[in-house]
């Protein structure tokens, strides 16, 4: 139930967060599950624990395995598992599928590529970006905070993009790379005030307690490529990242689709292991572009199990 997959490359930094949550004041102990050996907290070690984070500085193939984190609350010890796989660096340029993060889509006027997992690291701008192993050069490419912006996107811009940054730990620098695919939707057109196709305004979505639930925020912004169009979810008027509930996550990046020639974006909100308290929250699907912002509110209700009669 409390398990998470993480992966990295040998000789790079890898930082993993405990899947079990807790207050910042709680002690977290880490163990290598196969041997039950405690992970040290002293930073002089190559692999060490730092609260909810497990740090491989740098990682080695032999580090692969399952790590146990135990969050020591005032009452119980709560256990989580991190399944870590460290791969050898490829000699050629191809990035294998098992090292790829989720694919993102863009268009001529909307082309952000976020660098995966970067929030776990102590890094400073700018990021370095590569496409198919070649360093990106030219004024069309702008590294901004934790993402890459490509101006005047063309179909030729599709490909595998790698972000590279330096993690700093007590004055020592470690390289980190992460790769994801970028696809391009190319079409000329016009833009409109956002139209939210789903969810309906004030929609009530039935969910089952204990099960997973997905909410899709889908909006169209006109025809063809769109400039500064976005959809996102808010919880009780707060950004998902600021809300602080790890079970509720937005799908990283935005999927772009073209419905009847219209340029549409969707963002999936994933709620793992729905809890009763999730029904108390207000879920806002926001769609915005240069014309303005439109908001549709959704609430969750408990689905009553259907009686089956023979």
């Amino acid at each position: 139930k409390f398990s998470k997959q993480s992966w990295g490359l040998e000789n790079e930094a890898l930082i993993v967060r405990c899947p079990r949550q807790g207050k910042p004041s709680y002690t977290v102990d880490w163990y290598y599950s196969q041997t039950n050996k405690s992970i040290p907290t002293q930073e002089r070690n190559r692999v060490f624990a730092s609260g909810q984070l497990l740090k491989f500085l740098p990682a080695a193939v032999a580090d692969s395995g399952i790590y146990t984190c135990i969050v020591r609350s005032p009452t119980f010890n709560r256990t989580g598992y991190a399944n870590v796989t460290i791969y050898k660096k490829q000699s050629d340029c191809n990035v294998p599928d098992y090292l790829m993060y989720s694919t993102v889509s863009g268009s001529e006027k909307n082309s952000k590529i976020y660098c995966p997992t970067i929030d776990l690291y102590n890094w400073t701008a700018p990021l370095e970006w590569f496409k198919n192993c070649q360093a990106l050069q030219g004024s069309r490419y702008r590294a901004h905070k934790s993402f890459l912006v490509i101006d005047n996107v063309m179909t030729e811009d599709a490909g595998d993009y790698t972000c590279k940054f330096i993690h700093n730990e007590n004055g020592a620098n470690y390289s980190v790379t992460a790769t994801r695919s970028f696809t391009v939707k190319d079409e000329q057109g016009f833009s409109l005030f956002p139209v939210i196709g789903a969810p309906a305004q004030n929609e009530i979505k039935e969910v089952e307690i204990g099960k997973n639930a997905n909410l899709t925020c889908s909006a169209c912004f006109g025809k063809g490529t769109q400039f500064l169009a976005a959809v996102l979810w808010q919880l009780n008027g707060t950004k998902i990242t600021d809300f602080g509930e790890p079970r509720i996550q937005q799908e990283e990046g935005q999927n772009q689709s073209f419905s009847n020639g219209l340029a549409c974006l969707d963002m999936v909100l994933r709620i793992a292991d729905v809890k009763e308290e999730d029904l108390l929250l207000q879920y806002d699907c926001l769609a915005l572009n240069l014309h303005g912002l439109r908001r549709h509110t959704v609430r969750l209700s408990r689905k009553n199990p259907i009686d089956h009669h023979s």
């Epitope: 949550q21 807790g22 207050k23 609350s73 005032p74 809890k275």
Partner: antibody, heavy 121, light 106 residues
Framework: QVQLVQSGAEVKKPGASVKVSCKAS????????LHWVRQAPGQGLEWMGT????????VYNQKFKARVTMTADKSTSTAYMELSSLRSEDTAVYYC??????????????WGQGTLVTVSS | EIVMTQSPATLSLSPGERATLSCSVS?????MHWYQQKPGQAPRRLIY???KLASGIPARFSGSGSGTDYTLTISSLEPEDAAVYYC?????????FGGGTKVEIK
């Protein structure tokens, strides 16, 4: 919605035992630690202990350790608190309660209606 | 165990007045939770993690503090705020509550 429904009032003689039940609904029973808090008439709140229904592990307030037993039945989503060797000062309302988000220990957000246990000869 | 001392024991104020309830702790804690209890009812969570307002609680309630001194403030008393208020620590086991402050509305 989250509900914690407790068993009815009990009258016991000194030296006897009492077993109070707390039936949970509206959430996944094994995902949340259940706590027991008591309140003597006109007095404040006193934490007795907690149980993790998933594992059956318990943590008791030292004051009650020798006399209290907390159990959980996953099949019926019911927690139990048994207090033995009752004395008159155990006369109180006994509550079961749980946090809002378990891992954050963010206060007792849900409470049972309370069970009055009267100890009298 | 951590001993929680609430003051004053009783607070008698008029509607619209500001109520300040204190909770002093015998040793430092990271967070404080506050509850409201009316006669014949189970306690109700008001404030959690020192300053966060629980769901459905009016904004006139607020919490603050750190270390060994914490405060619950009711900015403008309403008649329905008459109740006993308890602070509670979840820093170390056993979890402990304050003795309560009774708020009376004149």
């Amino acid at each position: 919605q989250v509900q914690l429904v407790q068993s009815g009032a009990e009258v016991k003689k000194p030296g006897a035992s009492v077993k109070v039940s707390c039936k949970a609904s509206g959430y996944t029973f094994t995902d949340y630690e259940l706590h027991w808090v008591r309140q003597a008439p006109g007095q404040g709140l006193e934490w007795m202990g907690t149980i993790d229904p998933e594992t059956g592990d318990t943590v008791y307030n030292q004051k009650f350790k020798a006399r209290v037993t907390m159990t959980a039945d996953k099949s019926t989503s019911t927690a139990y608190m048994e207090l033995s060797s009752l004395r008159s000062e155990d006369t109180a309302v006994y509550y079961c309660t749980r946090a809002f988000y378990n891992d954050y220990d963010d206060g007792f957000a849900y409470w049972g209606q309370g069970t009055l246990v009267t100890v009298s000869s | 165990e951590i001993v929680m001392t609430q003051s004053p024991a009783t607070l008698s104020l008029s509607p619209g007045e500001r109520a300040t309830l204190s909770c002093s702790v015998s040793s430092s804690v990271s967070y404080m939770h506050w509850y409201q209890q009316k006669p014949g009812q189970a306690p109700r969570r008001l404030i959690y993690d020192t300053s966060k307002l629980a769901s459905g609680i009016p904004a006139r309630f607020s919490g603050s503090g750190s270390g060994t001194d914490y405060t619950l403030t009711i900015s403008s008393l309403e008649p329905e705020d008459a109740a006993v208020y308890y602070c509670q620590q979840w820093n170390t086991s056993p979890l402990t509550f304050g003795g309560g402050t009774k708020v009376e509305i004149k």
